[in-house]
């Protein structure tokens, strides 16, 4: 995993000016309706503000130098960093007695790398050491990929901090919501 090997603390990240996607235009306010407005939400209060109104899984461009020990690439490489939220919060409040917990209202999606590209870089080393050639794996595109409830934290860690959304307060959705139970509501469904 060359890409993993070079993405270390010694990497110098240089954001490229002008590469960030423009925020979508502000929507006019409508207080009588639930309307999707722009802006993120505080991590512990998923419904205090409206969710972002696009699948804003963004491909942010970063320029960085690749380092390997004391050696550093002659030129910086430009790569993508996957950032953003895949649509609205898919949690619904569920009150039982005095307690309040969240249950899912849709699959959980995360903004993660989709495709990678390999790039050959030349590393320059101090002390007259011969330059080294290395192949690095860089993110080429991002996607909103579904996670299942069976994904564990170790599988999430490579997706970045956005992936490890706390599951605090979440309980499995009641069995009453299974397809068979849903069908009981559906008369003349077939």
């Amino acid at each position: 995993q060359g890409w993993q090997a070079f993405k270390n603390d010694a990497t110098e990240i240089i954001p490229e000016l002008g590469e960030y996607p423009e925020p979508p235009p502000e929507l006019e306010n409508n207080k009588t309706m639930n309307r999707a407005e722009n802006g993120g939400r505080p991590p512990h209060h998923p419904f205090e503000t409206k969710d972002v109104s696009e699948y804003s899984c963004r491909e942010l461009h970063f320029t960085r130098y690749v380092t390997d020990g004391p050696c550093r690439s002659a030129k910086p490489v430009t790569e993508l960093v996957c950032s953003g939220q895949c649509g609205p919060a898919r949690l619904l409040p569920n009150a039982i007695g005095r307690g309040k917990w969240w249950r899912p209202s849709g699959p959980d999606f995360r903004c993660i790398p989709d495709r990678y590209r390999a790039q050959r870089v030349q590393l320059l080393c101090p002390g007259g050491e011969a330059p080294r050639a290395r192949k690095v794996r860089l993110v080429a595109s991002c996607k909103c990929k579904r996670l299942t409830r069976f994904h564990n934290q170790s599988e999430l860690k490579d997706f970045g901090t956005e992936a490890a959304r706390p599951q605090k307060g979440r309980k499995p959705r009641p069995r009453a919501r299974s397809a068979k139970a849903n069908q009981a509501e559906l008369e003349n469904a077939y």
Epitope: M33, N34, R35, A36, E37, R41, P46, F47, K50, D51, V52, S53, Y55, C57, C86, G87, P88, A89, R90, L92, P93, P104, S105, G106, P107, F109, K143, C144, K145, R146, T148, R149, F150, P172, R173, P174, R175, R177, S178, A179, N182, E185, L186
Partner: antibody, heavy 123, light 107 residues
């Protein structure tokens, strides 16, 4: 009976906007996200986006970015989809669809659909 | 976006025939595949979810199989009410995408 009842057919001119409504009954409206799917004449199905009725938070297919707005009115259990800057290729039947869930298989699907609203864009 | 390719796009069959429709995803979608039936002038109806789970009330002559990128919908013995268009839909990656449809016509 779980039902989604949509507003009637619309004829619009290019550049105009259309707002389609979808009234839910037979279930707790705020328990399920509402999705919108369209179908051009003789064509397949195209997913447009979804809205969480509790938060009003919506997510849209990037194809419609900047042109679509989904809203809900929980007091009337109604979802709305507004499409702006209409073009002739927006001529389609627009469906609202409820996203159902099977917790055993942790899977989701469109289990209830509205009857569809025909939107014709013509000069 | 994930492309969903259905084949054939149309087929002619007789009552009692065994019919197989295939759906291929451009990327691995695990088992997150649903099948819908649509009749002219009507909304789609869910038949099968999670590749092979039959929705309650759907006749057992319908079955689904597959995993990853290749999926199949089979109607073991075609009935008059089965003449319709069938769509697959992936739920693995946003945006959700549907196949182009397979129209099952009377021979």
């Amino acid at each position: 009976e779980v039902q989604l009842v949509q507003s009637g057919a619309e004829v619009k001119k290019p550049g105009a906007s259309v707002k389609v409504s979808c009234k839910a009954s037979g279930y707790t409206f705020t328990d399920y996200n509402m999705h919108w799917v369209r179908q051009a004449p003789g064509q397949g199905l195209e997913w447009m986006g979804e809205i969480n009725p509790n938060s009003g938070g919506a997510g849209y297919n990037q194809k419609f970015k900047g042109r679509v707005t989904m809203t809900t009115d929980t007091s009337t259990s109604t979802a709305y989809m507004e499409l702006r800057s209409l073009r002739s290729d927006d001529t389609a039947v627009y469906y609202c669809a409820r996203l159902g869930y099977d917790d055993i298989y942790d899977d989701w699907y469109f289990d209830v659909w509205g009857q569809g609203t025909t939107v014709t864009v013509s000069s | 976006d994930i492309q969903m390719t259905q084949s054939p796009s149309s087929l002619s069959a007789s009552v009692g025939d065994r019919v197989t429709i295939t759906c291929r995803a451009s990327q691995d979608i695990s088992n997150y595949l649903n099948w819908y039936q649509q009749k002219p002038g009507k909304a789609p109806k869910l038949l099968i979810y999670h590749t092979s789970r039959l929705l309650s009330g759907v006749p057992s002559r319908f079955s689904g199989s597959g995993s990853g990128t290749d999926f199949t919908l089979t109607i073991s013995s075609l009935q008059p009410e089965d003449f319709a268009t069938y769509y697959c839909q992936q739920g693995d990656t946003l945006p959700y995408t549907f196949g182009g449809g397979t129209k099952v016509e009377i021979k």
